[in-house]
């Protein structure tokens, strides 16, 4: 469950579960910072607009990744 | 099954300090952020505290703000509340909750069974 | 802080009967961040409701959610006798606190 902030980390909980790439609107990958000493991966989907923070140490997660960022690259030129 | 149990509520005196822990069984426990509850006698739900799944944020109800404190042990699979300077309005049942992760909010889905905390002199 | 207000505070009514609660904020909340709870007495609350219409894992489809901005509305199409206890609703805003309504009794006319 992301939360909006302004310091410190945007997500409270984390999931697990695999998502469909396709079903994905957009996928944020916030780097680890001053605010947030971790990675957070907030997924979005096409279905009402709705938000999701993904665990990056998730086996599933990690194929995700590669999914969305094989789909990227045959996409670009 | 998911599980959330209560323990450490009992009868204080004012001023003084109390824990309360929350066992959690079930789940991943370390995906999940966590809330205090409260409820007092014969009155609504009251949110007290939430704290991420790493223990980095902590929030917290501002009648309670500078008093209590919430913590975790992912490692034991438990929750925890230090009550310090308890006041006679903290007298109430205290709920620990999980903040369901598979959704933006989902709300709270697993409820424990609650613990008493009543202070008096 | 976003106040919570719910009507009425108790509603009286028959097994059978639809039930209607309000659930109204004191500024706008994203509907994905209002929940529905329903609290017997002697018992935990259960989640209902979840991002305004959406139902928890094993509540039946008699209970439904809507609304957007600052009103909302649960609804029991039909009451059943296990239906009577009291509802609140919740909002989980992008700060804290994530107040709570005063509740909404359900009791038998």
């Known amino acids: 469950v992301p939360l909006s902030r302004t310091v410190r980390c945007t997500c409270i909980s984390i999931s697990n579960q695999p998502v469909n790439p396709r079903s994905l609107e957009k996928l944020e990958i916030i780097p680890a910072s001053q605010f947030c000493p971790r990675v957070e991966i907030i997924a979005t989907m096409k279905k009402k607009g709705e938000k999701r923070c993904l665990n990056p140490e998730s086996k599933a997660i990690k194929n995700l990744l590669k999914a969305v960022s094989k789909e990227r690259s045959k996409r670009s030129p | 099954q998911v599980q959330l149990v209560e323990s450490g509520g009992g009868v204080v005196q004012p001023g003084r300090s109390l824990r309360l822990s929350c066992a959690a069984s079930g789940f991943t426990f370390s995906n999940c952020g966590m809330h205090w509850v409260r409820q007092a006698p014969g009155k609504g739900l009251e949110w007290v505290a939430l704290?991420?799944?790493?223990?980095?944020?902590?929030y917290y109800a501002d009648s309670v703000k500078g008093r209590f404190t919430i913590s975790r042990d992912n490692s034991k699979n438990t929750l925890y509340l230090q009550m310090n300077s308890l006041r006679a309005e903290d007298t109430a049942v205290y709920y620990c909750?999980?903040?369901?992760?598979?959704?933006?909010?989902?709300?709270?889905?697993?409820w424990g069974q609650g613990t008493t905390v009543t202070v008096s002199s | 802080e976003i106040v919570l207000t719910q009507s009425p505070g108790t509603l009286s009514l028959s097994p059978g009967e639809r039930a209607t609660l309000s659930c109204r904020a004191s500024q706008s909340v994203s509907s994905s961040y209002l929940a529905w709870y329903q609290q017997k007495p002697g018992q935990a609350p259960r989640l209902l409701i979840y991002g305004a219409s959406s139902r928890a894992t094993g509540i039946p489809d008699r209970f439904s959610g809507s609304g957007s901005g600052t009103d909302f509305t649960l609804t029991i199409s039909r009451l059943e006798p296990e239906d009577f206890a009291v509802y609140y609703c919740?909002?989980?805003?992008?700060?804290?606190?994530?107040?709570f309504g005063p509740g909404t009794k359900v009791d038998i006319k």
């Open positions: 919740q909002q989980y805003g992008s700060s804290p606190p994530f107040t």
């Open positions: 909750a999980r903040d369901w992760p598979e959704g933006y909010y989902n709300g709270m889905d697993v």
């Open positions: 704290i991420g799944f790493d223990g980095i944020n902590e």
